[in-house]
């Protein structure tokens, strides 16, 4: 059996070397001479020769200083043989523990640590954490037991101890009130890490703390009184620019200004914020009326996009806005005038009077009337009174100029102000119908096939309105009934069916068709009928010799 006591060896020993560690014994040495040897890391494998053993005595020796931070434990095997070289013992594992010396100082993980904290943060607010490491043994010794301290703070304002550091964790916290970004936006701390619980080796690093902005400063008007002027009736006109200062961080919601007009119930003004310089741009939201009010005194308040973090006074400004008088156009009353008149209204008679009012009550002005648009040239106006008369016959069925029985004319009124101003009124003449149109057929050109012809539907059109329209009466005249027949196609008699009585020669025919409306107004229309060399339904076919009264006349 082996006799091996526990083995430990301090690192960094002085010498002289080799130095005895322990004597190894085998019980077999009573039976004869025993020879000792060792194998393993530090003996016969790298690092080779750190440990040796005296062959005959069994003394285990170290040959050089050890470094725990490089190798903390060596595992060797001891061997015992007799003089003839036979093993007298099984190999035995030997553990050599290198004991620690405080030969490493702490090291910070960064040279500079960065953190941030909101201004106004209360004591106890965590800011950041610094971390250091130590290579020494932190299990069996205090050689790696690090303690953190703050060595200095720059600036030392408003207090030299604004922050504290947890000795054990390295967490930096606020310890004193009074952090103010606008006064001291950054702090630089020199922090120390020392082993042996602060009594041993030490090192330093820098912690840079940025104080972040909160909305603890209001925007303030400078100046607080303004003057501006604006012409009446004009919207979106810039009146003046309002100036503010805000100590908070530029181009942040805590700096950006929001303007509110406190006494603009009518919503006549608006203040927008210039995003570049935070100015307030006061403009008209709608046209102002000089005749109604000549001056406005506005009270404008300014706040930020985000609420104030602390109780702050809201800054206000006073703006005096003078409204400038402008010559305004006369206004027709009503702007659109509807007048009902029969389409057979007498030429030269007065239809209506259409006048305008002068908005410029502070000026004595004369109004002159003119017709601006009268596409059919039916009207004339008295320039002084606005009386409108007919100069030509009206026609409800003039569909180029009349839409839905309504003729639209534009009348203008011009004052004698400086500069001259002109207003426009719309005159709607609602033309009532008279029975001045006889019915007409549509189409007037018809095609039939000579063989197996398909009857053709002819629509009856009357430009008038009921009761001057359907039911219509149709009749073939001038001998057309010899070759052709008609019958009504629908109960309202608004269309007829035309067909030949017998086979007709290919060629062109003229059929006289008399159409009469419900009020007995009639008209004879000539239908142009072509009989084509085809069967069934006719397309368009070539023109042949004309035929009078539905009877073909030889050439």
């Amino acid at each position: 059996d082996w006799v091996i006591p526990p083995i430990s060896c301090p690192e960094n020993e002085k010498g002289p070397f080799p130095k005895n560690l322990v004597q190894i014994k085998s019980n077999k040495d009573k039976e004869g001479k025993v020879f000792y040897s060792i194998t393993g890391q530090g003996a016969d494998t790298p690092p080779v020769g750190v440990f040796i053993i005296e062959r005959e005595t069994g003394w285990l020796k170290v040959t050089e200083p050890l470094d725990r931070e490089r190798i903390a434990t060596y595992t060797l095997f001891s061997h015992a043989v007799s003089s003839n070289g036979n093993a007298v013992e099984d190999p035995m594992e030997i553990l050599i523990t290198v004991t620690d010396q405080n030969d490493n100082k702490p090291e910070f993980t960064q040279e500079v640590f960065k953190g941030s904290v909101m201004e106004g943060a209360l004591p106890g607010t965590s800011v950041m954490e610094v971390t250091a490491t130590d290579a020494d043994d932190d299990v069996n010794t205090y050689n790696a037991a690090i303690a953190y301290t703050i060595l200095s703070q720059d600036p030392e304002l408003p207090d030299k101890n604004m922050f504290t550091i947890n000795r054990n964790t390295g967490v930096i916290s606020v310890v004193t009130t009074g952090l103010d970004r606008e006064s001291f936006p950054t702090y630089t701390l020199v922090v120390q890490a020392a082993d042996l619980q602060g009594e041993g080796l030490s090192t330093t690093a820098t912690a840079v703390i940025t104080v972040t902005d909160t909305n603890d400063n209001p925007p303030i008007f400078n100046p607080t009184t303004y003057k501006g002027q604006v012409p009446e009736n004009e919207a979106n006109v810039v009146i003046t620019t309002l100036k503010v200062t805000d100590a908070d961080a530029p181009n942040t919601p805590a700096w950006e200004a929001v303007y509110t007009i406190l006494n603009d119930d009518g919503g006549q003004f608006v203040v927008t914020t210039n995003p570049v310089n935070n100015d307030g741009i006061l403009k008209t939201a709608k046209g102002l009326d000089f005749e109604a009010k000549q001056q406005y005194i506005l009270h404008v308040a300014v706040t930020n996009v985000v609420p104030f973090e602390v109780s702050l006074t809201t800054s206000t400004a006073t703006v005096t806005v003078d409204v400038l008088d402008v010559n305004e156009a006369p206004i027709f009353v009503p702007p659109e005038k509807r007048v009902e008149v029969s389409e057979d209204f007498g030429v030269g008679q007065e239809i209506t009077s259409y006048t305008a009012q002068e908005p410029d009550t502070f000026m004595e002005q004369k109004i002159t009337y003119r017709i601006w648009r009268d596409t059919a040239n039916w009207l004339e106006i008295n320039p002084d009174t606005g009386a409108i008369s007919t100069r030509a016959e009206l026609d409800r069925e003039d569909f180029e100029h009349v839409k839905n029985s309504t003729y639209t004319a534009l009348i203008i009124a011009t004052d004698n102000g400086s500069p001259v101003a002109t207003g426009t009124g719309t005159l709607l003449l609602i033309l009532s119908d008279v029975n001045d149109n006889a019915p007409i057929p549509e189409p007037r050109t018809i095609f039939f096939c000579e063989r197996n012809p398909k009857p053709q539907v002819i629509n009856i059109i009357d430009a008038d309105l009921p009761p001057n329209t359907s039911p219509f009466t149709a009749e073939l005249t001038h001998g057309a009934s010899a070759n052709w027949t008609i019958q009504y196609n629908d109960p309202t008699q608004e269309s007829i069916i035309l067909k030949p009585k017998m086979a007709l020669e290919v060629g062109d025919y003229k059929i006289n068709l008399k159409l009469m409306d419900n009020q007995n107004k009639d008209q004879v229309t000539t239908l142009e009928v072509s009989v084509c060399d085809c069967e069934g339904a006719a397309g368009v076919c070539r023109k042949a010799q004309p035929v009078e009264a539905g009877l073909q006349i030889p050439a």
Partner: antibody, heavy 120, light 106 residues
């Protein structure tokens, strides 16, 4: 009932002429066209032309305009077809026909046919 | 002029069979009219305006088509249907007839 009665068969010499008749009955003779159709032996039908008893107008198939002359005798309600300058090619059965209506493009009523044989 | 081509030239069928004969026009026509002609007799109007049966024609006959393609169909052929059938157009002058289809009953 509408009837078209044609004249009997004819055997004629080449170069001569023949006149075929078609007597209409059972309707107003002037109200409808009379058409003439040729059918060569074992062959199809060919339209020769038509005559309008209403206005004495004729319409011919270009192929037969120098071969046939169409006439009518309104007093006897009879239609005639003269065939001239006969050759063996003219040997055929010739039919007169009319439509149900004056403007029909098809032929509802047919005569019994007249066989014309051209032979030396 | 419009040329009408009929096919087949001869059509042979047993009683009760369904048969169809066609008529093709060299250009589009509005209608086709059909005639039946038995040996030694005049033609008889059979179908007019493409699909209308003439008076007395059995309902087993029908006509259809448009443009340039038309047909006559006999649903269940009978011995009395043996004849030559001609198609005819008059969409343009002169009216023309097809060459005929001879229907034989076995």
């Amino acid at each position: 009932e509408v009837q078209l009665q044609q004249s009997g068969p004819d055997l004629v010499k080449p170069g001569t002429s023949v006149k075929i008749s078609c007597k209409a009955s059972g309707y107003s003779f002037t109200a409808c066209y009379i058409h003439w159709v040729k059918q060569s032996h074992g062959k199809s039908l060919e339209w020769i032309g038509r005559f309008s008893p209403n206005n004495d107008r004729t319409t011919y198939n270009q192929k037969f305009k120098d071969k046939a002359i169409l006439t009518v005798d309104k007093s006897s309600s009879t239609a005639y077809m003269d065939l001239r300058s006969l050759t063996s090619e003219d040997s055929a059965v010739y039919y007169c026909a009319r439509g149900e209506e004056s403007w029909d493009a098809w032929f509802t009523y047919w005569g019994q046919g007249t066989l014309v044989t051209v032979s030396a | 002029q419009i040329v009408l081509s009929q096919s087949p030239a001869i059509l042979s069928a047993s009683p009760g069979e369904k048969v169809t004969m066609t008529c093709r026009a060299s250009s589009s026509v509005s209608y086709i009219h059909w005639y039946q002609q038995k040996a030694g007799s005049s033609p008889t109007s059979w179908i007019y305006a493409t699909s209308n049966l003439a008076s007395g024609v059995p309902t087993r006959f029908s006509g259809s088509g448009s443009g340039t393609s038309y047909s006559l169909t006999v649903n269940r052929v009978e011995a009395e249907d043996a004849a030559t059938y001609y198609c005819q157009q008059w969409s343009t002058t002169p009216p023309t007839f097809g060459g005929g289809t001879r229907l034989e009953i076995k």
